[in-house]
């Protein structure tokens, strides 16, 4: 789009005729204040359009905007548009007119707002005053807009002097209405409730001085309403809360409650949902799975943790060997239930450096007036092995034999193996596992008892050698869930003097 | 005319209990947050406890908690407030006071004189 | 709690001077998005109750004179009385309604001098 004269902004003299012409690649139009003005358009042969404004007979009121646009022009871009002031000094024009609405401004959030008071002659100086006030605010003035700012709620006038006559313009009225984007949150006392008791919601909006609630709840569909309360809040400005309070609540009033709030200004509006339900009676009901064994290891602390839903909040107890067991005084024992969301609980029983005695079985037991849930467990102590014991002897028969004994918990596994060049075993010499026949004719005969009090395992294994030739390195290796532990002893031939 | 008129103040042992009311007329009762505010002889004012409007929730000053109940009846238009384990130090006299929602106390009443003392 | 100072206790000023009272809140009574100051100035006379002045910090009550303005921030406020006159010789408190608990200055007495 061209514009001849360019501008931005011309000052034309009162009474004269002044013609304003706008080109471009398709059909243009003059405009001003959003009307089409009386202009002539054509089109050259080189498929350019232009529009010829001619304004005749200037008065003070021709100051203000003009456009140009593309004809018909939908989602202008903003070279789609050129704009031009025009001034035309008129001293008997004083303030320009507005419209009725524009003396009226209605904040709806701290921002800069224009008080468009405008003069015909951008030589003009304006001042800006309380309407009741004679002292000019130190406010910059923008002779094409007007006063902008931050305001006050108060009445102001603008003046000027045109040759030796104070002109005041009409007074202009800044009213602040708290307004903002609506944020809704709903929530309830309790999202789950047995029939007979009560349902209460609150929706709460802060930041806005008008807002309207409407509820959508089940009981309202079949035609049963329910009068929500409106309470203004005065721990802190704007902030309001509808309630929704529904006695003895039916098994139909479960289902999806919605607050929606609107404020009118603006025309902003959100909505939340809740969800609510109403049960027959309690329950309670186990979440997950827990084995019916557990392990624990020995001086080492454990948790053990049971994960429940219930309505209303039950009793939690836990027992070990039919005993009730408590926070025990010492510390060994600690016991918690949490309320991790309304109706999830988690309750955890903590051995603090288990001792084998804690080994035994446990039960859960969670319970109310209505329902009742338990959950048991055996408790097993883990116990890392350790090899108490390995002894190398040679008896008459000529074979050689070495004993292995360890402990532990669960039951260990023996691993026998043996290295035959000490110098490069065993971090070049990978051990040869012995015991299951191998080439060095070696028999193995492991034996098993479990001790009750301990609650351990005991193994004692002897591996027999039938002939050494030569010295040779024997581990042995004792492995559980918990652990492993391990023995070396070196054997020598009957032939060789031990060094 | 907006009118707030404050009784059952008077003389009252230590420990014991009052119950002051407040009448309100000349406006719509429930549009309005209500508050007590007290002032003890040849002292500054102290605000107590207030009301809100149509859902009547209460707040009170850290001094009273526990102590004072106010509370309305919307039907009869009466403002209370309910004082117990009354202390020498809650001697004053006992305003009455409407605000708008979010609004500076805009209408009192003339007050009633309420003496704690053995 | 919100904390108001007054300042100063008490004051003497000569018919037709200035009065100036000063009162500072603890924490900001300013409301961001529409720039309300949730603070107002009362006047009291013996044995009467407060009168509200100035409310939103700098509106004037309907009726009362113009020689009273207030002004100031979000925690720094002022009272003016321009021209005292004999009428005017009262205790005036600052109060904060932004939240509870509302909380009063411990108000300013102002005599002629």
């Known amino acids: 789009l061209v514009i001849t004269p360019p501008g931005p902004e011309l000052i034309l003299n009162v009474s004269s005729t002044f013609v304003l012409t706008c080109s471009g690649s398709a059909p243009v139009v003059w405009e001003r204040m959003s009307q089409e003005l009386p202009q002539e358009m054509a089109k050259a042969q080189d498929n350019t359009f232009s529009s010829v404004l001619t304004l005749t007979n200037l008065t003070g009121l021709d100051t203000g905007e003009y456009f140009c646009t593309y004809n018909d022009s939908r989602g202008l871009e903003p070279d789609e548009r050129k704009r031009l002031y025009i001034f035309v000094p008129d001293p008997t024009v004083g303030f320009l007119p507005n419209d009725a609405e524009e003396l009226f401004i209605f904040l709806t959030e701290i921002t800069e707002i224009t008080i468009p008071c405008r003069v015909t002659d951008p030589q003009l100086v304006v001042t800006l005053h309380e309407k009741k006030g004679d002292i000019a605010l130190p406010v910059p003035y923008d002779h094409q807009r007007g006063f902008s700012g931050i305001f006050e709620d108060r009445s102001y006038i603008c003046k000027t002097t045109i040759g030796d006559r104070e002109v005041d313009s009409d007074a202009y009225y800044v009213y602040r209405l708290q307004v903002s984007s609506i944020n809704v949150s709903v929530n309830a006392v309790q999202t789950v409730v047995r029939q007979g008791e009560n349902i209460t919601l609150m929706c709460i909006v802060i930041g806005n001085e008008v807002v309207n609630f409407e509820w959508m709840y089940p009981r309202k569909e079949s035609g049963r309403l329910v009068e929500p309360v409106t309470d203004f809040l005065l721990d802190m400005p704007y902030h309001i809360r509808s309630i929704l309070h529904i006695p003895s609540a039916e098994l139909e009033d479960s289902g999806t409650y919605t607050c929606n709030v609107t404020e009118s200004v603006n025309d902003h509006q959100d909505e939340k949902a809740i969800n609510i339900t109403v049960v027959e009676s309690g329950y309670v009901r186990l979440l997950g799975e827990v084995g019916a064994l557990q392990f624990a290891e020995l001086h080492r602390s454990r948790t053990l943790q049971v994960v429940f839903e219930a309505y209303p909040p039950p009793t939690v107890l836990w027992f070990k060997d039919n005993r009730t067991l408590g926070d025990s005084s010492a510390g060994e024992i600690a016991l918690s239930t949490r309320n991790v969301s309304e109706t999830r609980y988690v309750s955890e029983l903590t051995l603090v450096r288990v001792k084998v005695a804690e080994a035994g079985h446990y039960t859960m037991r969670a319970f109310h007036e209505d329902a009742e849930v338990q959950l048991s467990f055996q408790l097993q102590i883990n116990v890392p092995v350790r090899v108490l014991e390995l002894s190398e002897s040679h008896p008459d028969s000529g074979e050689q034999t070495v004993r292995c004994r360890g402990r532990g918990m669960p039951q260990p596994n023996i691993i026998w193996s043996a290295c035959r060049d000490l110098k490069r075993c065993p971090r070049e010499l990978p051990p040869m596992l012995l015991g299951n026949s191998s080439e060095e004719e070696s028999q193995l005969e492991t034996n098993v008892t479990y001790w009750e009090e301990e609650q351990e395992f005991e193994v004692v294994s002897t591996l027999r050698l039938q002939h050494v030739d030569r010295p040779l390195s024997v581990r042995c290796t004792l492995r559980n869930a918990v652990g492993q532990d391990m023995q070396e002893v070196i054997v020598v031939p009957h032939s060789l003097p031990f060094k | 005319q907006v009118q707030l008129v404050e009784s059952g103040g008077g003389f009252v042992q230590p420990g014991g209990s009052l119950r002051l009311s407040c009448a309100a007329s000349?406006?719509?009762?429930?549009?309005?947050?209500m508050s007590w505010v007290r002032q003890a002889p040849g002292k500054g004012l102290e605000w107590v406890s207030a009301?809100?409007?149509?859902?009547?929730?209460?707040y009170y000053a850290d001094s009273v908690k526990g102590r004072f109940t106010i509370s309305r009846d919307t039907s009869k238009n009466m403002l209370y407030l309910q004082m117990n384990s009354l202390r020498a130090e809650d001697t004053a006299v006992y305003y009455c006071?409407?605000?708008?929602?979010?609004?500076?106390?805009?209408?009192w009443g003339q007050g009633t004189l309420v003496t704690v003392s053995s | 709690d919100i904390q108001l100072t007054q300042s100063p206790d008490s004051l003497a000023v000569s018919l037709g001077e200035r009065a100036t009272i000063n009162c500072k809140s603890s924490?900001?009574?300013?409301?961001?998005?529409?720039?309300?100051?949730?603070l107002v100035w009362y006047q009291q006379k013996p044995g009467q109750p407060p009168k509200p002045l100035i409310y939103?910090?700098?509106t004037r009550e309907s009726g009362v004179p113009d020689r009273f303005s207030g002004s100031g921030s979000g925690t720094d406020f002022t009272l003016t009385i321009n021209s005292l006159q004999a009428e005017d010789v009262a205790v005036y408190y600052c109060?904060?309604?932004?939240?509870?608990?509302?909380?009063f200055g411990q108000g300013t007495k102002v005599e002629i001098k």
């Open positions: 939103w910090a700098s």
């Open positions: 000349g406006f719509t009762f429930t549009n309005y947050a």
């Open positions: 009301i809100s409007g149509v859902g009547g929730s209460t």
């Open positions: 924490q900001s009574v300013l409301y961001r998005s529409n720039n309300k100051k949730f």
């Open positions: 109060q904060q309604y932004y939240s509870t608990p509302y909380t």
């Open positions: 006071a409407k605000a708008p929602h979010w609004g500076p106390f805009g209408s």
